[in-house]
C-alpha cells in the first residue's frame, strides 16, 4: 500500500523538514528559515513559534520541530506548551486576583506557584504534631501520643512540664 501510495502521491516521499513544492513540480523543498515540518508529506511548512516578551526560548526551532518557550524570570508556565505565563509568588503565599497574598493561618505553600493548602491533621492518623507548621511548611507528624507513654523508647522524651504530644499554640 505504501508503495502504491508513493506512486500516486509523490508528496508522500518528502521527509520531515521539507515540503512538497507545487510550484516546482512537486519536488521536496527544504522548509524556509523560521519554519518547520515535523512530519513527512507536508504541502507547507509551519511558521516557528517566536518566544518574545514574557516568553523565553527554551528550545530553538529547527527544520523538523517547533521552538519551545518558557517564561521570563518571575513567571512560570501555564497551559499546554506554555501558552501563558503566570507571576511567581514567594513561598508562603498564593496568587489571587489582587496579587500575591500570604497563606492564611493553618495553610502553607512551599512553592512559588499554586495555592495554599491546609496543614496535615496529624490526629486523623492517630499521630501528634512533632514540628509546627508555618506559612511555608507543613506540620511534621510524630509518633502517636500512646507511643510516647512512659516506658516507651523515644528519641526525644517529651518535656516534663507539658502533656506529651501537644505543641505550644
Amino acid at each position: 500500500f505504501e508503495r502504491t501510495r508513493s506512486l500516486q502521491d509523490p508528496c508522500s516521499n518528502c521527509p520531515a523538514g521539507t515540503f512538497c513544492d507545487n510550484n516546482r513540480n512537486q519536488i521536496c523543498s527544504p522548509c524556509p528559515p523560521n519554519s518547520f515540518s515535523s512530519a513527512g508529506g507536508q504541502r507547507t511548512c509551519d511558521i516557528c513559534r517566536q518566544c518574545k516578551g514574557v516568553f523565553r526560548t527554551r528550545k530553538e526551532c529547527s527544520s523538523t520541530s517547533n521552538a519551545e518557550c518558557d517564561c521570563t524570570p518571575g513567571f512560570h508556565c501555564l497551559g499546554a506548551g506554555c501558552s501563558m505565563c503566570e507571576q511567581d509568588c514567594k513561598q508562603g503565599q498564593e496568587l489571587t486576583k489582587k496579587g500575591c497574598k500570604d497563606c492564611c493561618f493553618g495553610t502553607f505553600n512551599d512553592q512559588k506557584r499554586g495555592i495554599c493548602r491546609p496543614w496535615t491533621n496529624c490526629s486523623l492518623d492517630g499521630k501528634s504534631v512533632l514540628v509546627n507548621g508555618t506559612k511555608e511548611r507543613d506540620v511534621v507528624c510524630g509518633p502517636s501520643p500512646a507511643d510516647l507513654s512512659p516506658g516507651a523508647s523515644s528519641v526525644t522524651p517529651p518535656a516534663p512540664a507539658r502533656e506529651p504530644g501537644h505543641s505550644p499554640q
Partner: nanobody, 117 residues
Framework: QVQLQESGGGWVQPGGSLRLSCAAS????????MSWARQAPGERFEWISS????????SYLPSVKGRFTISRDNAKNTMFLQMDNLTPEDTAVYFC??????????SGPGTQVTVSS
C-alpha cells in the same frame, strides 16, 4: 492563531511623548483584559498597565501613573498606550500582552522606545 503587533516606538527627548499601538488578531479581542509591559536591557520583564475588556477600568505601575494612559478600540481590535513626560528610565522594548498583570501571553516582537537627549 493569536497575533499581537506593536508599533509606534521611536526615539524621543526627555519630556517628550509617544503613542504606542497594538493590533490584535486571532482571538475575541473584546472579551479579554489587555496589558502593556516592557523590558529594558539587562532588566526584568515589567508589567506597566492593564485595561479591562470594556475599557472602563485601568491599572498602572506606580512609576508611570499620571504619565501613561492605556485605552482600547474594540471595534478595531486595537489597544493604545499614550506615554507623556517620558524619562530615560522609560527606555525599553514595549510589548502588548493578552491577559492581566498576573497571567499573560505575548506574541509580538515589541517596539523599541528610546528616551535620551
Amino acid at each position: 492563531q493569536v497575533q499581537l503587533q506593536e508599533s509606534g516606538g521611536g526615539w524621543v527627548q526627555p519630556g517628550g511623548s509617544l503613542r504606542l499601538s497594538c493590533a490584535a488578531s486571532g482571538f475575541a479581542f473584546r472579551d479579554f483584559t489587555m496589558s502593556w509591559a516592557r523590558q529594558a536591557p539587562g532588566e526584568r520583564f515589567e508589567w506597566i498597565s492593564s485595561i479591562n475588556p470594556s475599557g472602563g477600568s485601568q491599572s498602572y505601575l506606580p512609576s508611570v501613573k499620571g504619565r501613561f494612559t492605556i485605552s482600547r478600540d474594540n471595534a478595531k481590535n486595537t489597544m493604545f498606550l499614550q506615554m507623556d513626560n517620558l524619562t530615560p528610565e522609560d527606555t525599553a522594548v514595549y510589548f502588548c500582552a493578552r491577559g492581566t498583570r498576573y497571567k499573560m501571553s505575548t506574541s509580538g516582537p515589541g517596539t523599541q522606545v528610546t528616551v535620551s537627549s
